[in-house]
Amino acid sequence: IVNGSDCQKDAQPWQGALLLGPNKLYCGAVLISPQWLLTAAHCRKPVFRIRLGHHSMSPVYESGQQMFQGIKSIPHPGYSHPGHSNDLMLIKMNRKIRDSHSVKPVEIACDCATEGTRCMVSGWGTTSSSHNNFPKVLQCLNITVLSEERCKNSYPGQIDKTMFCAGDEEGRDSCQGDSGGPVVCNGKLQGLVSWGDFPCAQRNRPGVYTNLCEFVKWIKDTMNSN
């Protein structure tokens, strides 16, 4: 997250981290039920660990943390790497969470966000595109949902209904390492960090997010059948 601020501890209890090896963060994720996460489909890896209830970027133990393995990764059937359409994936964890003040699911928004809606994006991603500076703790950033027209003007030929743009003034954006993390608007999960330009946080180059309102049925059906 570029030019965000430290999240309050336990204020994003649905925020997850996907880790390679013992503790290398590569993507964010969102807890949506006691045993299921959502992340971006482009975050798919054959082997990874899941960390929930953690505030710090470092692997130091925190009392609220819970660690899991992913036993099933189900990318949306319409996703085709390295495209951006339908960029979401369900992950089933090896067990259910212990519900606590640090670890809680978030409800998915059934209605699509409208222009001007204020939202919160969070993640442990780099705070500067070209230098890979990492925050000490989870970062939060208020962003505003942009109109479809402005979104399409920013990225001609690249935007479809499975995406929405959100941003703020130049200098504030999600960035590398935030992929798959949550965009929460009015207390409900509206999007996932998906893509954007490089470097992050350029004028007229907003972040682009998976438009989860388009996928509520697929998410429910897939969880029920697995």
Epitope: A40, H42, T126, G177, S194, W195, Q202, R205
Partner: antibody, heavy 124, light 107 residues
């Protein structure tokens, strides 16, 4: 299948500007999933990254060459170009163009498609 | 600037043998941001490994990558005749750079 082809003069005089073009076929340059790179290799030596250009035309250059390098894109021709000014004999090399992939995960996908390279000699 | 040092400079081995190539960074590099390439004479480099340990499309499983921090390794479990080439590591954690290369030659 995506292919990259470098083109440009094989001989450049010292102090002049080296200009090369990379033509992309079998795919489109204006894609928000990819960046486009120039890399060079002096005779008998290793690889040196020169710079990248991204979807919006934003660029990222090797700090040691930054003052002399310009990378640009012409989407109408599906080409991107390299200009290196004030060349010396040390700029004699095989110049490669390549494609890399990027997203907002914290992950480097490497450069998966390369041109075959074009030899540029700097000599009077 | 992150400097990558590859060793050995030349590795003389026979087909069927195991090759272990080292890449050492002057400062810590995220393993997610390290790649390996193979280059044969007169050809462009070919991507072998990305993210330190993931094989690129079409790369046989005799090639494997490992490591973290400042020390990374490319291993070729059983050398085939077509594997004799120069191998480069690359980091993209900060301003991208390549190692000096390791030549794997027939003994």
């Amino acid at each position: 299948q995506l292919q990259l082809q470098e083109s440009g003069p094989g001989l450049v005089k010292p102090s002049e500007t080296l200009s090369l073009t990379c033509t992309v076929s079998g795919g489109s340059i204006p894609s928000s999933s990819y960046y486009w790179s120039w890399i060079r290799q002096p005779p008998g030596k290793g690889l040196e990254w020169i710079g990248n250009i991204y979807y919006s035309g934003s660029t990222y250059y090797n700090p040691s060459l930054k003052s002399r390098v310009t990378i640009s894109v012409d989407t109408s021709k599906n080409q991107f170009s390299l200009k290196l000014s004030s060349v010396t004999a040390a700029d004699t090399a095989v110049y490669y163009c390549a494609r890399g992939e990027y997203d907002r995960s914290y992950y480097f996908w490497g450069m998966d498609v390369w041109g075959q390279g074009t030899t540029v000699t700097v000599s009077s | 600037e992150i400097v990558l040092t590859q060793s050995p400079g030349t590795l003389s081995l026979s087909p069927g043998e195991r090759a272990t190539l080292s890449c050492r960074a002057s400062q810590s590099v995220s393993s997610s941001y390290l790649a390996w390439y193979q280059q044969k004479p007169g050809q462009a480099p070919r991507l072998l490994i990305y993210g330190a340990s993931s094989r690129a499309t079409g790369i046989p499983d005799r090639f494997s990558g490992s490591g973290s921090g400042t020390d990374f390794t490319l291993t070729i479990s059983r050398l085939e005749p077509e594997d004799f080439a120069v191998y480069y590591c690359q980091q993209a954690f900060s301003s991208p750079s390549f190692g000096g290369g390791t030549k794997v030659e027939i003994k």
